[in-house]
């Protein structure tokens, strides 16, 4: 396959993927494009990683170049070092591999330079102008685990189609990163959709075990029949429908005569008309039209309540006179103090809920605003054992205090940079600056992957702990795969996880909602279980967006209510500001703003190291900073950034003259 075909392609291993995007971009545009997908420009630091890049790029044309994640500031030559003064876009210079096209030449390095990889031959590294739009770019995506590609089965209609969290759709994967979806089409009819998920026993795996397509008989998936499957003599299947239903034109599904019936409330197939109408409890058929239902006034029934009765549409409620309490049966009254707790029964809510159709459920989800609902036990997973969405790196903080962000020491150059963290080869993203996301997840739309924020109970400030994720920092939350966020709201009953509506029969029992708990609630104390974090890591609050294939059968539909986390992001180096804000002190978190959406930049006065009036407190004097592309003004100033609603706004910076001199195209570091 020609890698220079119009479509991107990827090669994945058990812990990372490389993806080739044949799109003409400048270095800065390529860097942004990778970040928006949750990755970074490729950083092939080892011969093994380079080999994977080589196999992905293949034997391309000599005339084609691909950006990788190496850049160098002007006059930053260090020719004796392996990377010659270049820095990975993840912020460090660690490498066990280089592939320079030429030996280092002792020049003055007057200009900023970026590195592109030759598409041909040995894929040598060439340096050049960062503003050149080369032929494409290589992204790298790190994750905690991957699922092996599915084995082809005899009954499959074609190879499985995989969709990765970074939006690549292909049949050509050996490994699928956590959060990927596999769509399998069977010869015998309907196919299956599988999700690469975290397994309860540890590791990741497909959400459903094979075989997915058993053959042409009735055994796999009922032969594709909605109701009854009959195996014919020749081995093929024919479908039949149960009484009251008729076979649809596709020969597999069954049509419900009730679908078009004029019943106001409940319809049952059968009868002379093909259906009959019924009314819910609390209603009765209207005398003039049996299709309609009218409210039953239960209060007219003698003895329905011991004392007082209030009727309402679809139900009634019993009340007791002053000095009496309603008993547990919701009918009887007893003198006050005779029983422990007042109970009331709402037939409208408890007795009459007969499970509405999916359209009603959808509407209910649109109206859901973080409320909690008692649910029967869900077979998919115990609520107290959450399906861990593979946070590659989750810092831990004491429960009784807010997480601290590292600050630079006063004399620390350069003036615009963020704390650097150590490189971990298995998880690329931990070397990026970690940032509290300022983007708000929104409800899924046709162009936006769904977001699953978990809305958790309101807690005392002592117990408010953000859930930290570092898989895919610094990008709009709608693009982030496989991570759950937590914001705290109304207190639910203990062990009550947020509900996520789903239509995904391959994964969950019908009409049941999978649970995604990520905290354990006991009384008013929430304990979030997180592994340790080195002191120079800053927290990142983020959200999940699982990208699903538009064409996948039985596609997973995740519905959620948007949540909002107010923050006060600041420019690098991190500042604690004294400006007033609608945010309570417990939520005031100073963060590096290198990748925050730019909005309303406010210049702060320059601080000399010896005369600082702004409350900058150096807590990590030896922190280092990742190199993030920035626009390199003559003497950059610190800026206070406010969040912007634009989710993919690129990082921007201010030079000496503020915005007025900001050039239209600039490849200097942001």
């Amino acid at each position: 396959q020609d890698p220079w075909a119009a479509e991107p392609r990827a090669a994945c291993g058990p812990s990372s993927c490389y993806a080739l995007f044949p799109r003409r971009r400048t270095f800065l545009e390529a860097w942004r494009a990778c970040r928006e997908l949750g990755g970074d420009l490729a950083t092939p630091r080892t011969p093994e990683e380079a080999q994977r890049v080589d196999s992905l790029v293949g034997a391309g044309p000599a005339s084609r170049l691909l950006w990788i994640g190496l850049q160098r500031q002007a006059r930053q030559c260090q020719l004796q070092r392996p990377l010659r003064g270049f820095t990975w876009t993840t912020g460090d210079q660690d490498t066990a591999f280089t592939n320079w096209a030429q030996p280092a030449s002792g020049g003055p390095c007057p200009a900023q330079r970026c590195v592109a990889l030759e598409a041909s031959g040995e894929h040598r590294w060439l340096e050049g102008s960062c503003t050149l739009a080369v032929d494409g770019y290589l992204c790298q995506f790190g994750f905690e685990g991957a699922c092996p590609a599915l084995q082809d089965e005899a009954g499959q209609a074609g190879p499985a189609v995989y969709t990765t969290p970074f939006h690549l759709v292909s049949t050509e994967f050996e490994w699928l990163p956590f959060g990927s979806v596999a769509a399998v089409q069977c010869q015998a009819g309907r196919g299956a959709s599988l999700l690469c998920v975290k397994q309860p026993e540890g590791g990741v795996g497909w959400s459903r075990a094979g075989p997915l397509c058993l053959g042409t008989g009735c055994s796999p998936d009922n032969g594709g029949c909605e109701h009854e499957c009959v195996e014919e003599v020749d081995g093929h299947v024919s479908c039949r429908c149960t009484e009251g239903f008729r076979l649809a034109a596709d020969g597999r599904s069954c049509e419900d005569p009730c679908a078009q019936a004029p019943c106001e409330q409940q319809c049952e197939p059968g009868g002379p008309q093909g259906y009959s109408c019924h009314c819910r409890l609390g209603f009765r058929p209207a005398e003039d039209d049996p299709h309609r239902c009218v409210d039953t006034d239960e209060c007219q029934i003698a003895g329905v309540c011991q004392q007082m009765c209030v009727n309402y549409v679809g139900g009634f409620e019993c009340y007791c006179s002053e000095g009496h309490e309603l008993e547990a049966d919701g009918i009887s009254c007893s003198p006050a103090g005779a029983m422990g707790a007042q109970a009331s029964q709402d037939l409208g809510d408890e007795l009459l809920d007969d499970g509405e159709d999916e359209e009603d459920e959808d509407e209910a989800w649109k109206a859901f605003n973080g409320g909690w609902t008692e649910m029967p036990g869900i077979l998919w997973m115990e609520p107290t054992q959450p399906p861990d969405f593979a946070l590659a790196y989750r810092p831990s903080f004491p429960e009784d205090r807010e997480p601290q962000i590292p600050y630079p020491e006063p004399t620390w150059p350069p003036p615009l940079s963020a704390p650097r963290v150590p490189y971990h080869s298995s998880v690329l993203s931990v070397t990026r600056p970690v940032v509290v996301s300022a983007t708000h997840p929104t409800l899924p739309s046709a162009h936006q992957p769904p977001v699953i924020p978990a809305t958790h109970p309101a807690l005392s400030r002592d117990h408010q702990i953000p859930v930290i994720a570092a898989n895919y920092p610094d990008l709009p939350s709608a693009y982030q795969p496989g991570i759950l966020s937590v914001s705290h709201s109304a207190q639910p009953p203990a062990h009550q996880p947020p509900m996520i509506s789903t239509k995904y029969p391959e994964l969950f029992p019908a009409h049941q909602s999978p649970m995604f708990p990520d905290t354990r609630v006991a009384g008013t104390q929430t304990t979030t279980h997180l592994p340790g974090i080195p002191p120079n890591h800053a927290p990142l609050v983020t959200t999940l967006g699982a990208q699903l294939p538009p064409q996948a059968p039985d596609a997973l539909v995740l519905r959620t209510q948007a949540t909002q986390l107010p923050i006060i992001p600041t420019a690098q180096p991190s500042l604690t500001t004294t400006s007033r804000s609608p945010v309570s002190p417990a939520h005031q978190i100073s963060v590096p703003a290198a990748t925050q959406p730019a909005a309303l930049p406010t210049l702060l006065p320059s601080q000399s190291p010896t005369n600082q009036t702004s409350p900058i407190s150096p807590t990590h004097p030896h922190s280092k900073a990742p190199q993030i592309p920035r626009e390199d003004g003559p003497s950059p100033k610190l800026a206070l950034w406010l969040p912007s609603p634009a989710p993919t706004a690129a990082p921007t910076a201010l030079g000496e003259a503020g915005l007025a001199e900001h050039s239209q195209r600039d490849d200097r570091w942001l």
Epitope: S63, L65, A111, A133
Partner: antibody
């Protein structure tokens, strides 16, 4: 050594078409992109479009779109540029040039070799 | 389009002189600038690429500098064969090349 040899001068009437050739030698033809430029008398050079012999990928200057077509005969290591609906202001020297890929470890998109140019005169 | 303005348009100089030609871009082009020499009736020759890198075989008296919007070509000591037309080219928004109008070096 690398050479780009262009076809001879052309005189055309307004409304006619002209097809110029650029024969490459001394290097692997499919490894380098070929660009076409022109220079009208007393004017600066003007970029018209390019073709990548590796995959026949072409891009044209919007100013000429619809009038210019760049093609290849890979077996003959030759690039062609055809300009239709000629008008008097198309009178110019037309150049083909090879875009460099890398020099001494640097990638760059400057033109390292040029053809000698072809004068096209459009006159009624 | 990005406009390139060269100055001067004409220059009368003598052998041994130091010559500086400037090229201004209408917007930031980074270092994606090349300089060419063209003699009458001949094809242009590449002198400097990426603003400051001397092309293979070009004499050391030719040098380039600058980045962003301002670029210079310097000939440290003019030789008889250097009398020609010189023009700059930007390619930051490749493939949309644009060129300077040229500077003609004449013998005084």
């Amino acid at each position: 050594q690398v050479q780009l040899v262009q076809s001879g001068p052309e005189v055309k009437k307004p409304g006619a078409s002209v097809k110029l050739s650029c024969k490459a030698s001394g290097y692997t033809f499919t490894d380098y992109v070929i660009h076409w430029m022109r220079q009208a008398p007393g004017q600066r050079l003007e970029w018209m479009g390019y073709i990548n012999p590796y995959d026949d990928d072409t891009t044209y200057n919007q100013k000429f779109k619809g009038r210019v077509t760049i093609t290849l005969d890979t077996s003959a290591s030759t690039a062609y540029m055809e300009l239709n609906s000629l008008r008097s202001e198309d009178t110019a020297v037309y150049y083909c040039a090879r875009r460099g890929n890398s020099y001494d470890g640097y990638f760059d998109y400057s033109m390292d070799y040029w053809g000698q140019g072809t004068l096209v005169t459009v006159s009624s | 389009d990005i406009q390139l303005t060269q100055s001067p348009k004409f220059m009368s100089t003598s052998v041994g002189d130091k010559v500086t030609i400037t090229c201004r871009a209408s917007q930031n082009v980074g270092t994606a600038v090349a300089w060419y020499q063209q003699k009458p009736g001949k094809a242009p020759k590449l002198l400097i690429y990426s603003a400051s890198n001397r092309y293979t075989g070009v004499p050391s008296r030719f040098s380039g500098s600058g980045s962003g919007t301002e670029f210079t070509l310097t000939i440290s000591s003019l030789q008889p064969e250097d009398f020609a037309n010189y023009f700059c080219q930007q390619y930051t928004n490749y493939p949309m090349y644009t060129f300077g109008q040229g500077t003609k070096l004449e013998i005084k």
